[in-house]
Interface confidence: low
């Protein structure tokens, strides 16, 4: 566990005031594990939100302001915010402790290079390609077929993002069913709209949150005939490769630790996104965002 490098009594270091969720996401996306900020809740005035970079994502934890002037996060209550931060210096949130506050002016994500000129809004959009059929199992879902290109609107949850399809329909999509796309030639936004100007798959840190329903650029060469539903474990185990390291909390005996590249035998796909599996004789639960399923029809893609 990395040691914390901040003074919890220095409110100016970690309290960012009325920063939006999207702004917090932008500041923390791709930053070091354990970087955090505290902001005002935009949906519940008077409450706060602890936004944390953990496990290659940004998590947002609500901090309720109680009538007795105490602060509550999950089931824990504290007399003041510095006490809450002190607690999470040494206790895990989900996968990290609090290590350092985010800089007041966001620095570029780790491993990225600052662009000399900012991209236009359209270049800022984040696109994904769908890997499997998803019929949708909730009214809020966005159903899709394998091979569609969707634009990401918002990332409200680790495993479920809000996306828009080419018809302008918006809904929630399961992250493990898609892969991110980045433009292979980002120069000039008015390129051939029918050409496939997307590269495969590299994390895109910035994302826009447009409220319009402009259609997506069409992409030629999308596989239309081969429709692949997510494999089912009913016909035996499904194999997947770990694409993200996972170090579970030491107290969680049901969790399965993963190293990037581990081959996971998936034995059960629970609908809540916590899958059951086995690695080298170790069994346990893991979030389905941490693995990529081997596609039996495309063995070359599994490399």
């Amino acid at each position: 566990m990395s040691s914390a490098r901040f003074d919890s009594s220095d409110r100016s270091a970690w309290y960012m005031g009325p920063v939006s969720r999207q702004e917090a996401q932008t500041r923390l996306q791709g930053q070091r594990h354990g970087m955090f900020l505290v902001r005002d809740s935009s949906t519940c005035p008077g409450d706060y939100v602890l936004s944390v970079s953990e496990n290659s994502r940004v998590s947002h934890y609500i901090i309720n302001s109680l009538p007795n002037r105490r602060f509550k996060i999950g089931d824990q209550e504290f007399d003041h915010l510095p006490a809450l931060l002190e607690f999470y210096k040494i206790h895990y949130l989900d996968t990290t402790t609090l290590i350092e506050p985010a800089p007041r002016y966001p620095s570029p994500p780790m491993g990225s290079v600052s662009a000399p000129n900012l991209p236009t809004a359209e270049d800022n959009l984040e696109y994904v390609r769908t890997l499997y059929d998803f019929p949708g199992n909730d009214a809020e879902d966005l159903p899709f077929k394998k091979g569609e290109i969707l634009v990401i609107i918002e990332k409200p949850e680790e495993q479920w993002w809000s996306a828009r399809n080419k018809d302008g329909r918006v809904g929630m999509i399961p992250v493990p069913y898609v892969e991110k796309l980045v433009r292979s030639s980002p120069h000039g936004k008015h390129g051939n709209r029918n050409s496939n100007s997307y590269g495969i798959p590299e994390p895109a840190h910035a994302y826009a949150q447009p409220q319009t329903t402009t259609p997506l650029p069409a992409v030629s060469g999308s596989p239309g005939a081969a429709i692949t539903p997510l494999p089912s474990t009913q016909n035996g185990p499904v194999f997947a490769k770990a694409i993200q390291k996972r170090v579970p909390c030491a107290y969680d005996k049901t969790a399965l630790a993963l190293e990037v590249g581990d081959i996971v035998k998936v034995t059960r796909m629970n609908i809540n996104g916590q899958w059951e599996g086995e690695v080298n004789g170790r069994k346990g639960l893991f979030p389905f965002t941490h693995v990529k399923i081997f596609d039996p029809q495309n063995p070359d893609e599994n490399e």
Epitope: S42, T43, G74, D138, A139, E140, P156, G168, I271
Partner: antibody, heavy 126, light 112 residues
Framework: QVQLVQSGAEVKKPGASVKLSCKPS????????IHWLRQAPGQGLEWMGI????????SSAQKFQGRVTMTRDTSTSTIYMELSSLRAEDTAVYYC???????????????????WGQGTLVTVSS | QSVLTQPPSVSGAPGQRVTISCTGS?????????VHWYKVIPGTAPKLLIY???NRPSGVPDRFSGSKSGTSASLAITGLQSEDEADYYC????????????FGGGTKLTVL
């Protein structure tokens, strides 16, 4: 604070239509889906449909398809639900509800309805 | 006919403990969907009581607790008070239904 304020009670004749309104406040209008539910006298809660205030996309339960129309007016941040071809069994209290983040450390797969309107009683009688 | 099954009524004296069950199937609660509980007093807006099987929103007393096992869930209320008299509904989702939001038939709690 978050509130969903619904329009007042309605009395309608069979075959008519009713249009109910729901005005959310205290949060960004476009950020949360709004669902419509109803409760008939002596019956349980029943889900009717959903509207995404951002794009206007709607979806309704099979039982109500063809009879229910959900719309939104972004200029007034108001959601509407119209039910046509009313019958006596449509007599119920109609609720709008926000399905949103309760936001704690627990990751909930499908969010609950965290805020509800006060309900609108619709009476269908000849 | 509701997708989730609840007892129509339960009762208890002040200070007692009561539980309300909610039974589903492999396509809803058993499919790992979360269960949420609501308190409904006629004429007022329903109130979220328990979400994600066993979590209380802020402001809900710790006398209320939820649990889930297999294809069923339950709501427990300890130290029963007169203001607890209301209808209680469980809610989940069903993978076999397009609308997916499903409720129990509701349980009327009477405080004797």
């Amino acid at each position: 604070q978050v509130q969903l304020v619904q329009s007042g009670a309605e009395v309608k004749k069979p075959g008519a239509s009713v249009k109910l309104s729901c005005k959310p406040s205290g949060y960004t209008f476009s950020s949360y889906y709004i669902h419509w539910l109803r409760q008939a006298p002596g019956q349980g809660l029943e889900w009717m449909g959903i509207i995404n205030p951002s794009g206007g996309y709607t979806s309704s339960a099979q039982k109500f398809q063809g009879r229910v129309t959900m719309t939104r007016d972004t200029s007034t941040s108001t959601i509407y639900m119209e039910l046509s071809s009313l019958r006596a069994e449509d007599t119920a209290v109609y609720y709008c509800a926000r399905r949103g983040e309760v936001g704690t450390m627990v990751r909930v797969f499908r969010k609950p309805f965290d805020y509800w309107g006060q309900g609108t009683l619709v009476t269908v009688s000849s | 006919q509701s997708v989730l099954t609840q007892p129509p009524s339960v009762s208890g004296a002040p200070g007692q403990r009561v539980t309300i069950s909610c039974t589903g199937s492999s396509s809803n609660i058993g499919a790992q969907y979360d269960v949420h509980w609501y308190k409904v007093i006629p004429g007022t807006a329903p109130k979220l009581l328990i979400y994600g099987n066993d979590n209380r929103p802020s402001g809900v007393p710790d006398r209320f607790s939820g649990s889930k096992s297999g294809t069923s869930a339950s709501l427990a209320i300890t130290g029963l008070q007169s203001e607890d008299e209301a209808d209680y509904y469980c809610q989940s989702n069903d993978i076999s239904l397009s609308g997916s939001v499903v409720f129990g038939g509701g349980t009327k709690l009477t405080v004797l």
